[in-house]
């Protein structure tokens, strides 16, 4: 069915992979697509297979090299075509000249850790995962904590406009379970979104000391 | 916001051709997917075909595969549709569409925000 409305969506990681998202109303769930891209000013072609996610989405990761390698850069443009299998021909279903560095998204932070923790704060620090030296300095953050009893999707969002990979949280009760995520921007790019977030760090403040008004 | 007027539309026997032409105004065109769309009497809109905003990418359906070619000159804000061996079951209303940017081009007319008015194309037999 090509009458339900389709949506192609791309995001680079800002070194070597190009994630792709295809939705199609209608589509049948068993059809055969794949993503292929094809840049203006390299010498390689690179094709996924999408596979489903959802009744009618499907999703595929564009592997461009090693993954700290650095594959495109920002006068890069890369046709990006979406085929998918009707009999014993490949039928074109969408098309898109994508500019790497106007769509990024990049890796979820990673190896977050519990520097130092007291009663009532808690020093973290994270790293970020694959992403390119272009950037330098010029990145952001979201940061969120889970407090008992309460939603992720409660939970105030910190940010960080700078490129800080440690923050202090304050105000914490004594003696509590808390979980902590982190997520990333560049500040680069027309239709750049945030990194997804990162896994959470559970970590509890120490207790009060007993006979104190802490 | 992209503004779309076609032209070039017209009468013309079985086997002959037309060029159909889309202006557009807005600062964005240059960096916009563009496609051509078509409503025959009594049915609903389909897609004929797409362009990237660079031309390198271009697709089409299936009934006019081999006869038409998309094509566009983003100096002059501009997007053609070259139409070969005409069929008289050609006949419709052909309209030009813009996708918002930094938007693919696709199949369905839900991918496109920008539609032109339309030029009248009939086939003969």
């Known amino acids: 069915a090509v009458n339900g409305t389709s949506q192609f969506t791309c995001f680079y990681n800002s070194r070597a992979n190009i994630s792709c998202v295809w939705s199609q109303d209608g589509a049948l769930q068993d059809t055969s697509c794949q993503v292929h891209a094809w840049p203006d000013r390299r010498r390689w072609n690179q094709t996924c297979e999408l596979l489903p996610v959802s009744q009618a989405s499907w999703a595929c990761n564009l592997i461009l090299g090693a993954p700290d390698s650095q594959k495109l850069t920002t006068v890069d443009i890369v046709t990006l075509r979406v085929l998918c299998r009707e009999g014993v021909r490949w039928r074109v279903m969408a098309i898109q000249d994508f500019k790497p560095f106007e769509n990024l998204r990049l890796m979820a932070p990673i190896s977050l850790q519990v520097v130092h923790v007291e009663t009532h704060r808690c020093n973290i620090s994270w790293e970020i995962s694959q992403a390119s030296h272009y950037f330098e300095r010029h990145l952001e953050f979201e940061a969120r904590t889970l407090s008992p009893g309460h939603t992720w999707e409660e939970a105030p969002l910190l940010t960080l406009k700078q490129k800080q990979e440690w923050i202090c949280l304050e105000t914490l009760t004594p003696d509590t379970q808390y979980e902590f995520q982190v997520r990333v921007k560049p500040l680069q790019g027309e239709f750049t979104t945030w990194s997804p977030w990162s896994q959470p760090l559970a970590f509890r403040t120490k207790p009060a000391a007993l006979g104190k008004d802490t | 916001e992209v503004q779309l007027v076609e032209s070039g539309g017209g009468l013309v026997q079985a086997g002959g051709s037309l060029r159909l032409s889309c202006a557009a105004s807005?600062?964005?065109?240059?960096?916009?997917?563009m496609g051509w769309f078509r409503q025959a009497p009594g049915k609903e809109r389909e897609f004929v075909a797409a362009?990237?905003?660079?031309?390198?990418?271009?697709m089409y359906a299936e009934s006019v595969e081999g006869r038409f070619t998309i094509s566009r000159e983003n100096a002059k804000n501009m997007v053609y549709l070259q139409m070969n061996s005409l069929k008289p079951e050609d006949t419709a209303i052909y309209y030009c569409?813009?996708?918002?940017?930094?938007?693919?081009?696709?199949?369905?007319?839900?991918?496109?925000?920008?539609w032109g008015q339309g030029t009248q194309v009939a086939v003969s037999s």
């Open positions: 807005g600062r964005t065109f240059s960096t916009t997917e």
């Open positions: 362009i990237t905003w660079t031309g390198r990418g271009t």
């Open positions: 569409a813009a996708a918002r940017r930094g938007r693919a081009a696709v199949r369905s007319e839900g991918g496109y925000d920008f």
